[in-house]
């Protein structure tokens, strides 16, 4: 309740996470024009990227383009791609939407299809569904460790969300366990009112609130975070240009002294902990 | 699939030449040639994209062999000269995404280089 006699302070916070978790995913794998199903373990360094600010992010999903080399091919014939003639392919040209700087040739890409010739990581990535299901669907499982330092420099009050009576092993539960900051990631989606398995195909943005009523005053203290959860980005992803949350990054190798690269185009999770609240003192 | 039919293998001495032949069943942007050796893996010997351009060869036969198409038959050759014993071995036609990514293979032609 609003007391009307306290100075009132806003909350400085910082914070800092921790997720835990093991996937195994199985997908097709193709070898020397063999596909068979390969089984992979991921965990924490596989799936989760350090953020700036009071975020974190835990993959869901992926789609790969393995062993590209910088060299000449033609581009993927995406809409509009398409050339029948070198007219139609302007030497130097680096189109937006293409993977690469453009030779002026115009070459085949396939048995029915000519698409401009680029300079480019070859072969170019296709435009590729997410995977449906998503191959990290396990994620649901995950917990994600949440340490949240704040202080009211006003009123000389420094404290934590984490008191040293806390059970390592607990789970956060909005009412059987409301101070356990353990969550785990299916449960944050269920208080939201959001299916995971179905955001994780294509990612998405989630919103941890973490809100502090501080009552600062020795007779009727109290200072303890309300935890509270909601979806942030547009979850209608028929009506969104860009649906969900996704970013590519590259790891890189030498075979045969040619350097190459595996790109992934990663869909998952950004978390976002959005701490507010006030401190009160007489 | 595309369909590859080899030709223009045999026994020749070393230090002689002999020319590969590779015609595709349709056409494609890169063509290029592997060859593998008893009891080995199969490695790369050279490649072309379209027109000829880029061009690409293995190291160990820089200088000796030279691959050439021709874009209107759907065709590769490998002219190998200057051949050692250490070039014997099964030389398969390959077409491609570029010079350094193959997804069809032919069937092969025997070189066998004596001595």
């Known amino acids: 309740s609003d007391k009307l006699y306290q100075r009132k302070e806003p909350v400085i916070s910082s914070v800092h996470t921790k997720v835990k978790g093991i996937a195994e995913v199985t997908e097709n794998v193709t070898e020397g024009g063999v596909t068979k199903l390969g089984h992979s373990i991921f965990d924490t360094a596989d799936y989760t990227f350090p953020l700036q600010g009071n975020s974190f992010f835990v993959m869901t999903n992926y789609v790969k383009s393995e062993g590209q080399v910088q060299t000449l091919c033609p581009e993927y014939p995406r809409r509009g791609a398409q050339c029948s003639s070198d007219r139609r392919c302007k030497k130097g040209w680096m189109d937006p939407q293409s993977k690469g700087i453009q030779t002026g040739r115009c070459v085949p890409y396939d048995k029915t299809r000519k698409t401009c010739e680029v300079s480019a990581w070859c072969p170019t990535e296709e435009e590729k569904e997410a995977p449906r299901p998503a191959l990290l669907r396990s994620a649901e499982n995950f917990t994600v460790l949440i340490k949240n330092n704040i202080h009211f420099p006003g009123h000389n009050y420094t404290t934590r969300n984490i008191l040293p009576t806390m059970n390592g092993s607990c789970t956060f539960h909005k009412t059987w366990d409301p101070q356990c900051s353990i969550f785990r990631l299916g449960d944050i989606f269920q208080e939201a009112g959001e299916n995971f398995t179905e955001v994780a195909v294509q990612g998405g943005i989630m919103g941890i609130e973490i809100y502090w009523d501080c009552n600062l005053d020795s007779w009727s203290h109290h200072c303890r975070p309300r935890y509270s959860f909601r979806r942030l980005d547009d979850k209608n992803t028929d009506e969104s240009f860009v649906p969900g949350y996704n970013f590519r990054y590259a790891k890189y190798y030498k075979e045969n002294n040619v350097e190459k690269r595996t790109l992934i185009k990663a869909f998952g999770i950004r978390f976002d902990i959005l701490v507010f609240g006030t401190g009160g003192k007489f | 699939e595309v369909q590859l039919v080899e030709s223009g293998g045999g026994l020749v001495q070393a230090g002689g030449s002999l020319r590969l032949s590779c015609a595709a069943s349709e056409r494609t942007y890169s063509m290029g040639w592997f060859r593998q050796a008893p009891g080995k893996e199969r490695e790369f010997v050279a490649g072309?994209?379209?027109?000829?351009?880029?061009?690409r060869y293995a190291d160990s036969v820089k200088g000796r062999f030279t691959i050439s198409r021709d874009n209107a038959k759907n065709a590769v050759s490998l002219q190998m000269s200057g051949l050692k014993p250490e070039d014997t071995a099964i030389y398969y036609c390959a077409t491609g995404t570029s010079v350094y990514h193959y997804q069809y293979w032919g069937q092969g032609t025997q070189v066998t280089v004596s001595s």
């Open positions: 072309s994209g379209w027109d000829g351009i880029p061009t």
